[in-house]
């Protein structure tokens, strides 16, 4: 791992009870095509070890969802951010599901060892569990 | 080519005959501005020379389309997945229409040499062949 | 930068007058998580410093956005491209949001030193300049 | 082998409703759309209107008015209503199913045609 | 709408020669990567017949003596060489947009 080739790439576990909207991720081969080399997971959320320029991308399919459903629901917002250390606590992406059931979005972000990203789903709907639906990654790109 | 930075971004080429739903790509300098620089095209389809976990993206948009066109044709789905060899087929990645006409992603997956990848687009759309709507492309990340 | 590491994530900064569709883009540290590490800004344009192969992203939300409103102002869209010189001008990437407030996409792309990239956005509406919405960048690849 | 089969009436009077029926074989209504198209030797082929296989219709401007496309997917039937009707609508009425692709609005398989005359 | 102007109106061409008739957009129906116009010929009581579909593919079962060509606003159908069971009227319709419309025919005599 030495050359920073820190990457990872989650799948939906589950969401968190009623008052937490955060989205719990699991990872390993055993799963399916989900893995980490180099972060970490910290109760389904994703740690990071190596401090530099990540890509970080992600994909979020709401359960048995038509645009309908999505429409009548609306607000649906989910947002990827650093949760922890308290002090660089920052929302990186932000994407509303409006009439759609699919969001998927990917940005560069300077990401620093220790730094936990969370990802909030807020809203009512149920996020599918598909591993080709919902998924979390993030790749080491440059220090 | 040693360092494993295989790539390929792929242009449309056609879709296929009606009981078929994969979409048939074509890279190259002389068509654009796609290429493959270590991946091949087999009958249209990208397959892998190289072991790896990659960054697979994708952008497909439905030709002539409205939002009232998509949702009157719904569902139209896209499909990211290994088609061949059978023994390792599998869905990547999947996005549907709903009341869009354009959708993009992309994940981080493990493939292997030989791994052919199809993109299935299900519904009765034609997708655009602008080369800046509708594109699908894989990067090598690390071993 | 000699190993070819260029990147750049950028926030918006403005847009042009109203003949002018395109975004007006910042980048650096004192402003946020955005920075340049190779590509340079030219009164808001992204400029390239190193040929080869990048990955383009880029998310723009449309400001104080519901579904209604989108489609009340039809049509939006959104395309980056190179600008100049103008001899290699193209359109890269276009995404046009229907009834949806957010575009995101991402595509692999040869880019020269020189090359300025543009993001143009037409409509009537306005973009959002929260940093976690309307982003843009780059990362070199490979030669 | 596909096939459209249209009845409906040849004369109409003045003011009155038009109505015919396609009955489909060969192929299924879930999954492709009908078209509506007449033929009249002042005004050439006209489009009418369409059902897609979702069940959603479209129509030209000019008869949304007093047109109306309906089906019944499991009896593969599709109903045409065409209220008002002068004598400028004597014509061919005709169903035709669009291609596979649902954007492609083009007729790859026609009925056999209605004459309709409008006359008291 | 959009308005599809054929020409000519009427021709006649001998046995194994070449006919063509040309079809006039009042704008353009090239769109993301296609052309959305296609061909069609009725012969006299009977329903048009689908030829040839954005712009330059066959139809399934239509000889291939028939050839389209085209994009932007100018179209050409081209018979060649024409035979005896190719007299009838042509017509050129775009899809564009809705509503699609029908050029007004050129109807083919055959020498």
């Known amino acids: 791992e030495s050359l920073g080739w820190d990457v990872a790439e989650l799948q939906l576990n589950h969401t968190g009870p009623q008052q937490d909207p955060r989205l719990y991720w699991q990872g390993g081969p055993a799963l399916g095509r989900s893995f980490l080399h180099g972060p970490e997971l910290d109760k389904g959320q994703l740690r990071i070890h190596r401090d530099g320029i990540y890509m970080v991308h992600i994909q979020v399919t709401l359960a048995i969802c038509s645009s309908t459903t999505a429409s009548r629901h609306h607000p649906t917002t989910l947002a990827v951010g650093i949760c922890s250390p308290a002090s660089r606590s920052i929302s990186l992406l932000r994407l509303s599901f409006h009439q759609g059931c699919t969001i998927a979005s990917q940005r560069l972000t300077p990401l620093a060892r220790g730094d936990t990203l969370c990802t909030n789903l807020t809203g009512t709907l149920l996020p599918s569990r598909n591993t080709d639906e919902t998924f979390f990654g993030v790749q080491w790109v440059r220090p | 080519e040693s360092l494993g930075w295989d790539v390929a971004e792929l242009q449309l080429n056609h879709t296929g005959p009606q009981q078929d739903p994969r979409l048939y790509w074509q890279g190259g300098p002389a068509l654009g501005r796609s290429f493959l620089h270590g991946p091949e095209l087999d009958k249209g389809q990208l397959r892998i020379h190289r072991d790896g976990i990659y960054m697979v993206h994708i952008q497909v948009t439905l030709a002539i389309c409205s939002s009232t066109t998509a949702s009157r044709h719904h569902p139209t789905t896209l499909a990211v997945g290994i088609c061949s060899p059978a023994s390792r087929s599998i869905s990547l990645l999947r996005l549907s229409f709903h009341q869009g006409c354009t959708i993009a992603s992309q994940r981080l997956t493990p493939l292997a040499r030989g791994d052919t990848l199809c993109t299935n687009l299900t519904g009765t759309l034609l997708p655009s062949r602008n080369t800046d709507e509708t594109f699908f492309g894989v990067q090598w990340v690390r071993p | 930068e000699s190993l070819g590491w260029d990147v750049a994530e950028l926030q918006l900064n403005h847009t042009g007058p109203q003949q002018d569709p395109r975004l007006y883009w910042q980048g650096g540290p004192a402003l946020g998580r955005s920075f340049l590490h190779g590509p340079e800004l030219d009164k808001g344009q992204l400029r390239i410093h190193r040929d080869g192969i990048y990955m383009v992203h880029i998310q723009v939300t449309l400001a104080i956005c519901s579904s209604t409103t989108a489609s009340r102002h039809h049509p939006t869209t959104l395309a980056v491209g190179i600008c100049s010189p103008a001899s290699r001008s193209i359109s890269l990437l276009r995404l046009s949001f229907h009834q949806g407030c957010t575009i995101a996409s991402q595509r692999l792309t040869p880019l020269a030193r020189g090359d300025t990239l543009c993001t143009n956005l037409t409509g009537t509406l306005l973009p959002s300049r929260n940093t976690d919405e309307t982003f843009f960048g780059v990362q070199w690849v490979r030669p | 082998q596909v096939q459209l089969q249209q009845s409906g009436p040849g004369l109409v009077q003045p003011s009155q409703s038009l109505s015919i029926t396609c009955t489909v074989s060969?192929?299924?209504?879930?999954?492709?759309?009908v078209h509506w198209v007449r033929q009249s030797p002042g005004k050439g082929l006209e489009w009418l209107g369409v059902?897609?296989?979702?069940?959603?219709?479209d129509y030209n401007a000019a008869f949304i008015s007093r047109l109306s496309i309906s089906k019944d997917n499991s009896k593969s039937q599709v109903f045409f209503k065409m209220d008002s009707l002068q004598s400028d609508d004597t014509a061919i009425y005709f169903c035709?199913?669009?291609?596979?692709?649902?954007?492609?609005?083009?007729?790859?398989?026609w009925g056999q045609g209605t004459s309709v005359t409008v006359s008291s | 709408d959009i308005v599809l102007t054929q020409s000519p109106a009427s021709l006649a061409v001998s046995l194994g020669q070449r006919a063509t008739i040309s079809c006039r957009a009042s704008?353009?129906?090239?769109?993301?990567?296609?052309?959305?116009m296609h061909w069609y010929q009725q012969k006299p009581g009977q329903a048009p017949k689908l030829l040839i579909y954005?712009?330059?593919n066959l139809e399934s079962g239509v000889p291939a003596r028939f050839s389209g060509s085209g994009s932007g606003t100018d179209f050409t159908l081209n018979i060649h060489p024409v035979e005896e069971e190719d007299a009838a009227t042509y017509y050129c319709?775009?899809?564009?947009?809705?509503?699609?419309?029908f050029g007004g025919g050129t109807k083919l005599e055959i020498k």
């Open positions: 059902i897609w296989s979702t069940g959603i219709t």
């Open positions: 704008k353009s129906v090239s769109a993301s990567g296609y052309t959305w």
């Open positions: 319709q775009h899809s564009r947009e809705l509503p699609p419309t």
């Open positions: 060969g192929f299924s209504l879930t999954t492709y759309a």
């Open positions: 954005l712009a330059s």
């Open positions: 035709a199913r669009n291609p596979h692709y649902g954007n492609l609005n083009a007729m790859d398989y």
